[in-house]
Interface confidence: low
């Protein structure tokens, strides 16, 4: 499943490009193991935001079917419970270029120790 | 064609540099607040067309207070399951907005 | 008012190559997304793919090494392309567009291929 | 691929009886992303229920559907002379899309 998310992402890369979207979002770049949990849900949700921004069918269909796929894989895990991580809200907010490409490599860790 | 005034956003300011049709403008938190993960401080000028009268959308952003600050006073660690992310649309449109299949 | 029409041809010989053309219109191929869909006589419904509005296509795997969607977005048309026909893909192909949670809320009226020598 | 079982492949009922329609699915199909369909001979389907419950634009209000995971209901109240057709459940949890065999509901 992770690696169908990691395509949805290439996705609306490609989709994004022919747009405008300025939004800064909350993203985590040096993610510790023992906050990945927390750190992936924090890209999921900032996700929504590039889907309501865009207004594109598109990229919303795309969004929809990564957090699906995501919360797909992370319920198979089991319930791993993380403590003393950062909400989102305390993160950097970076530019959509950078927020992908750091959900890229945080979707690669997951893959790596599955 | 231009919008008027947009809405007010609990514990957020908007500096609108535009009021024509199809601009598109930010509405910022106030200091001590953040923007909640997940909802967008955008505002666009769109026209109702029943109407032919300007508007602006609203904006999906709650600005919470800055978790930082709240940190600072003693406090358990903030704890997370792996309960997964609900999608927030609940209709057919991008928008969340259930208005029959059309975009505005 | 949202349409959708197919068009092609009505017999295709068996190994040769099927060109559908979906004409639509009351909505844009840039922002929706069109989905072929198809279904032998008698039977049920089967997905072969989806053309996205900015272009990408998602495939059914059963179908891929063979399928291709491709748009013109000016003339508001979406093409399928299908190599090496056989009798087993007489159906009636249907496009349909594309609203959230992959669903199809406006379909176009059909047009049955035959495939026969 | 999610494999999506309809029952009973034929319902004969009479107008104003209430119609059941089972939809199964092999795998869990995540928040309930499954889709009803009525199709009449000689036209294109046309969808009635999306998201599992929620009733599609200009569909009468004696269509409604329910369920979740991997079991999935339509139910028709009462049935006009119009309802009887032959219905389609479709998933979109994955990849690829998948339809249902079909229930046909006919005049008893």
């Known amino acids: 499943n992770w690696v169908n998310v990691i395509s949805d992402l290439k996705k609306i890369e490609d989709l994004i490009q022919s747009m405008h979207i300025d939004a800064t979002l909350y993203t985590e770049s040096d993610v510790h193991p023992s906050c990945k949990v927390t750190a992936m849900k924090c890209f999921l949700l900032e996700l929504q935001v590039i889907s309501l921004e865009s207004g594109d069918a598109s990229i919303h269909d795309t969004v929809e079917n990564l957090i699906i796929l995501a919360n797909n894989s992370l319920s198979s895990n089991g319930n791993v419970t993380e403590s003393g991580c950062k909400e989102c809200e305390e993160l950097e907010e970076k530019n959509i270029k950078e927020f992908l490409q750091s959900f890229v490599h945080i979707v690669q860790m997951f893959i790596n120790t599955s | 064609i231009t919008c008027p005034p947009p809405m007010s956003v609990e514990h957020a300011d908007i500096w609108v540099k535009s009021y024509s049709l199809y601009s598109r403008e930010r509405y910022i938190c106030n200091s001590g607040f953040k923007r909640k993960a997940g909802t967008s401080s955008l505002t666009e000028c769109v026209l109702n067309k029943a109407t032919n009268v300007a508007h602006w959308t609203t904006p999906s952003l709650k600005c919470i207070r800055d978790p930082a600050l709240v940190h600072q006073r003693p406090a358990p660690p903030s704890t997370v399951t792996t309960a997964g992310v609900t999608p927030q649309p609940e209709s057919l449109s991008p928008s969340g907005k259930e208005h029959h299949h059309h975009h505005h | 008012q949202v349409t959708l029409k197919e068009s092609g041809p009505v017999l295709v010989k068996p190994t040769e190559t099927l060109t559908l053309t979906c004409t639509v219109s009351?909505?844009?191929?840039?922002?929706?997304?069109v989905h072929w869909i198809r279904q032998p006589p008698g039977k049920a419904l089967e997905w072969l793919g989806v053309?996205?509005?900015?272009?990408?296509?998602d495939y059914n795997p059963s179908f891929m090494s063979r399928l291709t969607i491709s748009k013109d977005t000016s003339k508001s048309q979406v093409v399928l392309t299908m190599t090496n026909m056989d009798p087993v893909d007489t159906a009636t192909y249907y496009c349909?567009?594309?609203?959230?949670?992959?669903?199809?809320?406006?379909w176009g009226q059909g047009t049955t291929v035959t495939v026969s020598s | 691929e999610i494999v999506l079982t309809q029952s009973p492949g034929t319902l004969s009922l009479s107008p104003g009886e209430r119609a059941t329609l089972s939809c199964r699915a092999s795998?869990?199909?995540?928040?309930?992303?499954l889709a009803w369909y009525q199709q009449k001979p000689g036209q294109a389907p046309r969808l009635l229920i999306y998201a599992a419950s929620k009733l599609a634009s200009g569909i009468p209000d004696r269509f409604s559907g329910s369920g979740s995971g991997t079991d999935f209901t339509l139910t028709i109240s009462r049935l006009e002379p119009e309802d009887f057709a032959v219905y389609y459940c479709q998933q979109r949890a994955s990849y690829p899309l998948t339809f249902g065999q079909g229930t046909k509901v006919e005049i008893k």
């Open positions: 009351g909505f844009s191929l840039t922002t929706y997304a």
């Open positions: 795998q869990s199909v995540i928040y309930s992303y």
């Open positions: 349909a567009k594309n609203a959230a949670y992959y669903v199809m809320d406006y």
């Open positions: 053309i996205w509005g900015a272009g990408s296509t």
